[in-house]
Interface confidence: low
């Protein structure tokens, strides 16, 4: 009797082991993603940003998938969603072709299931950079709180690609989830 | 029977209240420090900011340790890191030994048993903050999912410190874990 | 004595299952509100946004409460607010009132018992919008790890609401419950 | 077209000093970067220093501490003060222009150092 | 800082003939990439600057392409006054760096 009871013991310790287990890795994808610099766009123009690292250096990921320029859900889940988006130039890369520049980003999920785009987050500023200083920087950070179903996609959109600062402190974006969906 | 029964689950039950407790409390590390303005550097160079408070105000600190200006790691896991700086200037303070300003936050990650310093994040903006307006003001926000060893040190740099906004909802950094290292 | 046995190991399973269920679910309430454009304050004074979505689109709010324009913490914890404001202008809408701006966001916490309000995060730039360019645009974003109680209220205060981009990917705040107190 | 002259090679002992000049002419110079690059007998290309049109300087590691580039505007000039001199520094000197790279080189100057 | 990797060394070919030349960067420099000619006893000389744009006055032929890390120096048709050493160079962050040249010689 006593030796059944403690076979049950270990079965509910075990099962539940198990499911603490489980649920507290599987329950938390994240993602870090690095820009990678030697595929960025030139031109000024609105582009989707498709070359990140997700392997090396800062960038890591973990129950999530980065497959053709795209962070993919595979669980769903509340995540926190950021992205941290740097621009620089400097006099001697030559001439901006515009002194008045629009440096933006835009954070968008994307669902296959329903073909459709949206736009999650964006930040970003006008800026005038003028030919009497001979450095220019300017950083965008934007985050929030999203519920994603697997299969939905993440992707960043950045206006000026040729502008980015393809350091890995630098420009860089992320997920991590909080919670499951109830 | 019965009673032996009852035993054996009141020890499943308080063993498991035991490790839910101790895990999540001892899982979820976290700090939130504020800017001791009392010690600010002068001048425009950048600066590691090492006067920090951690339990006054908003800051706060649990399981991780701030000393010698950096906040050292407790415990190994994935932690959210982040940064608010915000520089500030008022005519009324004298004026700038330049109108062009290269306004920027480093967030650094040290290792001791290897000894090397990292930028995890950085973030900012060049300014032109010119004598024709009596106040000026910007801030930067940086934030990220990062993998931490424990004994690890994260520090702030920053550029053109004797600007620094003072107030404790101004300049800020921080961290909390997310989940453990698999 | 083995059904016996088995209706005590459900017990304990079962009030573990609500136990695990029953915490997890309450010990995470979210929200993330995005501006209701509706009605947004004129004047380029500093001001309280009252009017937010919280059930549309991407916003939504689970275990808080939202009223009266503000954020109502339920459950005492460790929380990470983070906001997210937009402000632009475009010629066609007219001249500013100036074209040196201060774009400012500033989150407050509000305690009912002590009638007291707190600042607990700041960010923003000074701007200087000149009539050379047709369009402007500035984001800002702040975020940070706070103890909340029950009862105590968030609120967001911007400057220049006019300027205010009533999309809900651009201005936007939230929070998240990361761990117990203590 | 764009024109740069260069003087003030020579010879130095080392731990000598040496001021090299670059003059620019048929284009506004104040609104250009300038730098110096240099290159030792027989080897590659090496940046030394450069200086922008708001008068920020860089240098390369290698001269750091020794050597300070400046330009005055009023004259069209750029300068480069080196110190410290060492066998190491020997090579032909050149100033360039550096909008969209290095468009325009002076014709060079030698600077030997030797005992 | 980043290195610059030019290949080959020193190559032989005729008049008429096509090269090309390639560099590589240790790390994405997008296309801050510019090319140099230099004869013996002269000064440098810009070809391309910004990976693919050709400098003022320089003849067709001469054409650069690439991005990221890998770039390429192409000279369509080989005329006896290209015979020199050409370098690449990045402008991407600071010290802008060299390549260590190719040497093309006549064949």
């Known amino acids: 009797g006593s030796q059944h009871i403690r076979a049950e013991k270990a079965m509910v310790d075990g099962s539940w082991l198990d499911l603490a287990k489980r649920s507290k890795l599987e329950a938390q994808p994240f993602a870090h993603l690095t820009i990678n610099a030697t595929d960025i766009p030139s031109g000024s123009h609105k582009v989707s940003l498709s070359s990140w690292y997700h392997d090396r250096g800062w960038a890591k990921i973990s129950n999530m998938t980065f497959s053709n320029g795209k962070l993919i859900v595979n669980q769903d889940g509340f995540y926190y969603l950021y992205a941290n988006i740097c621009f620089r130039h400097h006099e001697t890369s030559g001439d901006l072709a515009t002194e008045y520049l629009q440096l933006m980003v835009y954070v968008t999920k994307t669902s296959i299931k329903i073909p459709s785009s949206h736009t999650l987050m964006k930040g970003g500023s006008t800026k005038y950079w003028s030919g009497n200083s001979e450095f220019h920087f300017y950083s965008i950070n934007v985050g929030g709180f999203f519920k994603l179903r697997s299969g939905e996609e993440i992707s960043i959109e950045v206006s000026n690609p040729s502008l980015l600062d393809p350091d890995q402190d630098a420009t860089y974006f992320g997920a991590f989830k909080v919670r499951d969906i109830d | 029977g019965s009673q032996h029964i009852r035993a054996e689950k009141a020890m499943v039950d308080g063993s498991w209240l035991d490790l839910a407790k101790r895990s999540k409390l001892e899982a979820q590390p976290f700090a939130h420090l504020t800017i001791n303005a009392t010690d600010i550097p002068s001048g425009s160079h950048k600066v590691s900011l090492s006067s920090w408070y951690h339990d006054r105000g908003w800051a706060k600190i649990s399981n991780m340790t701030f000393s010698n200006g950096k906040l050292i790691v407790n415990q190994d896991g994935f932690y959210y890191l982040y940064a608010n700086i915000c520089f500030r200037h008022h005519e009324t303070s004298g004026d700038l030994a330049t109108e062009y300003l290269q306004l920027m936050v480093y967030v650094t990650k040290t290792s001791i048993k290897i000894p090397s310093s990292h930028t995890l994040m950085k973030g900012g903006s060049t300014k032109y903050w010119s004598g024709n307006s009596e106040f000026h003001f910007y801030s930067i926000n940086v934030g990220g999912f990062f993998k931490l060893r424990s004994g690890e040190e994260i520090s702030i740099e920053v550029s053109n410190p004797s600007l620094l906004d003072p107030d404790q909802d101004a300049t800020y950094f921080g961290a909390f874990k997310v989940r453990d290292i698999d | 004595g083995s059904q016996h046995i088995r209706a005590e190991k459900a017990m304990v399973d079962g009030s573990w299952l609500d136990l695990a269920k029953r915490s997890k679910l309450e010990a995470q309430p979210f929200a993330h509100l995005t501006i209701n454009a509706t009605d947004i304050p004129s004047g380029s004074h500093k001001v309280s946004l009252s009017s937010w979505y919280h059930d549309r689109g991407w916003a939504k709010i689970s275990n808080m409460t939202f009223s009266n324009g503000k954020l109502i913490v339920n459950q005492d914890g460790f929380y990470y607010l983070y906001a997210n404001i937009c402000f632009r202008h475009h010629e066609t809408s007219g001249d500013l009132a100036t074209e040196y701006l201060q774009l400012m966001v500033y989150v407050t916490k509000t305690s009912i018992k002590i009638p007291s309000s707190h600042t607990l995060m700041k960010g923003g730039s000074t701007k200087y919008w000149s009539g050379n360019s047709e369009f402007h645009f500035y984001s800002i974003n702040v975020g940070g790890f706070f103890k909340l109680r029950s009862g105590e209220e968030i609120s967001i205060e911007v400057s220049n609401p006019s300027l205010l981009d009533p999309d809900q990917d651009a201005t936007y705040f939230g929070a998240f419950k990361v761990r117990d107190i203590d | 077209e764009v024109q740069l002259v260069q003087s003030g090679g020579g010879l130095v002992h080392p731990g000598g000093s040496l001021r090299l000049s670059c003059v620019g002419s048929?284009?506004?110079?104040?609104?250009?970067?300038m730098h110096w690059v240099r290159q030792a007998p027989g080897k590659g290309l090496e940046w030394v220093s450069g200086?922008?049109?708001?008068?920020?300087?860089n240098y390369a590691d290698s001269v750091k501490g020794r050597f300070t580039i400046s330009r005055d505007t009023a004259k069209n000039s750029l300068y480069l003060q080196m110190n410290s001199l060492r066998a190491e520094d020997m090579a032909v000197y050149y100033c360039?222009?550096?909008?969209?790279?290095?468009?325009?080189w002076g014709q060079g100057t030698l600077v030997t150092v030797s005992s | 800082d980043i290195q610059m990797t030019q290949s080959p060394s020193s190559l032989s070919a005729s008049v008429g003939d096509r090269v090309t030349i390639t560099c590589r960067a240790s790390q994405g420099i997008s296309t801050w990439l510019a090319w140099y000619q230099q004869k013996p006893e002269k000064a440098p000389k810009s070809l391309i600057y910004a990976a693919s744009s050709l400098q003022s006055g320089v003849p067709s032929r001469f054409s650069g392409s690439g991005s990221g890390t890998d770039f390429t120096l192409t000279i369509s048709s080989l005329q006896p006054e290209d015979f020199a050493t050409y370098y690449c160079q990045q402008y991407n962050s600071y010290p802008p760096t060299f390549g260590q040249g190719t040497k093309v010689e006549i064949k």
């Open positions: 048929r284009f506004t110079f104040s609104a250009y970067p």
């Open positions: 360039a222009r550096g909008r969209n790279s290095f468009d325009y």
């Open positions: 200086i922008g049109s708001g008068g920020g300087t």
